[in-house]
Amino acid sequence: LCQGSNYSTCASCPSCPDRWMKYGNHCYYFSVEEKDWNSSLEFCLARDSHLLVITDNQEMSLLQVFLSEAFCWIGLRNNSGWRWEDGSPLNFSRISSNSFVQTCGAINKNGLQASSCEVPLHWVCKKCPFADQALF
């Protein structure tokens, strides 16, 4: 049901694994502990998921309801411009760096924030239910 390329959207999917939240056609994992950006990415990949890639403003607004003031890592990095981990550019929201070390993106209830990738933060993974391959 959710088969396809790594960057397709889930179709109408069954329920999510334990400790994952179903929203729309995706499953989301909001971490309790904190890790740096790379370790957060590894955590998600090990669970057949990816650090959160937000597709549009609507998804961002919906997710922010579940967030607090605390920032969470998402799949956004500045490699000659802010891009999501699926390769798409950030084009529905703004994020700005205040220093050259702020090359990873995070989100809280108020919006996006650039940060040094070394800072330990909570993180959000996104996947299709179970082990399906369509991550975004």
Partner: antibody, heavy 120, light 107 residues
Framework: EVQLVESGGGLVKPGGSLRLSCAAS????????MSWVRQAPGKGLEWVAT????????YYPDSVKGRFTISRDNAKNTLYLQMSSLRAEDTAVYYC?????????????WGQGTLVTVSS | DIQMTQSPSSLSASVGDRVTITCRAS??????LAWYQQKPGKAPKFLIH???TLAEGVPSRFSGSGSGTDFTLTISSLQPEDFATYYC?????????FGQGTKLEIK
């Protein structure tokens, strides 16, 4: 309350070495970039060194590169500055400073400073 | 390297005056500018980042403006405790350069 307390300053001869320490408290040391900034007597502020959270990345201006080494011990909440091949122009008050968080590299908190005098 | 130049290097003013200090960057630094206040024998105190955002606990009589190469720090109504030396600093990239300072003295 954020506290940064520098120590290790003193009188040293030209060509000599000195190690400064900065004991941090009141915040989670291992979440922040840390820096050293100095001020020669009667002069302005000069950035000396910055170290990343893990200590894996360090940055220096040309004036101290190859002579000064910044390091940190996150288990001891302590920042260090190893200074060698010291020159008269290194005479200054050395301040330890913490960034604003998330890699915002302005100097949000400062210690009281420790005086280094290089003279024969 | 980016150079930061402050003007004036010193100025005299009276309590209640409105004072403006200027900082000019040698090239476009967008809004990557911080301001600090330093009193004799004390460590600098952080006032403003990103050219205009006040640090926590800084009185509202302080304000920052500008972007690109020209920046200003304004004190709307000088208080006795404001007499000090003020420094601007480029905070985006290496090297983090400071202006030479502006000494604000009592007239």
């Amino acid at each position: 309350e954020v506290q940064l307390v520098e120590s290790g300053g003193g009188l040293v001869k030209p060509g000599g070495s000195l190690r400064l320490s900065c004991a941090a408290s009141g915040f989670t040391f291992s979440r922040y970039y840390m820096s050293w900034v100095r001020q020669a007597p009667g002069k302005g502020l000069e950035w000396v060194a910055t170290i990343s959270i893990s200590g894996g990345n360090v940055y220096y201006p040309d004036s101290v590169k190859g002579r000064f080494t910044i390091s940190r011990d996150n288990a001891k909440n302590t920042l260090y500055l190893q200074m060698s091949s010291l020159r008269a122009e290194d005479t200054a008050v050395y301040y330890c400073a913490r960034e604003g968080g998330y890699g915002n590299l302005w100097f949000a908190y400062w210690g009281q400073g420790t005086l280094v005098t290089v003279s024969s | 390297d980016i150079q930061m130049t402050q003007s004036p290097s010193s100025l005299s003013a009276s309590v209640g005056d409105r004072v403006t200090i200027t900082c000019r960057a040698s090239e476009n630094i967008y809004s990557a500018l911080a301001w600090y206040q330093q009193k004799p024998g004390k460590a600098p105190k952080f006032l403003i980042h990103n050219a205009k955002t006040l640090a926590e606990g800084v009185p509202s009589r302080f304000s920052g403006s500008g972007s690109g190469t020209d920046f200003t720090l304004t004190i709307s109504s000088l208080q006795p405790e404001d007499f000090a030396t003020y420094y601007c600093q480029y905070h985006y990239g290496i090297p983090f350069t400071f202006g030479q300072g502006t000494k604000l003295e009592i007239k």
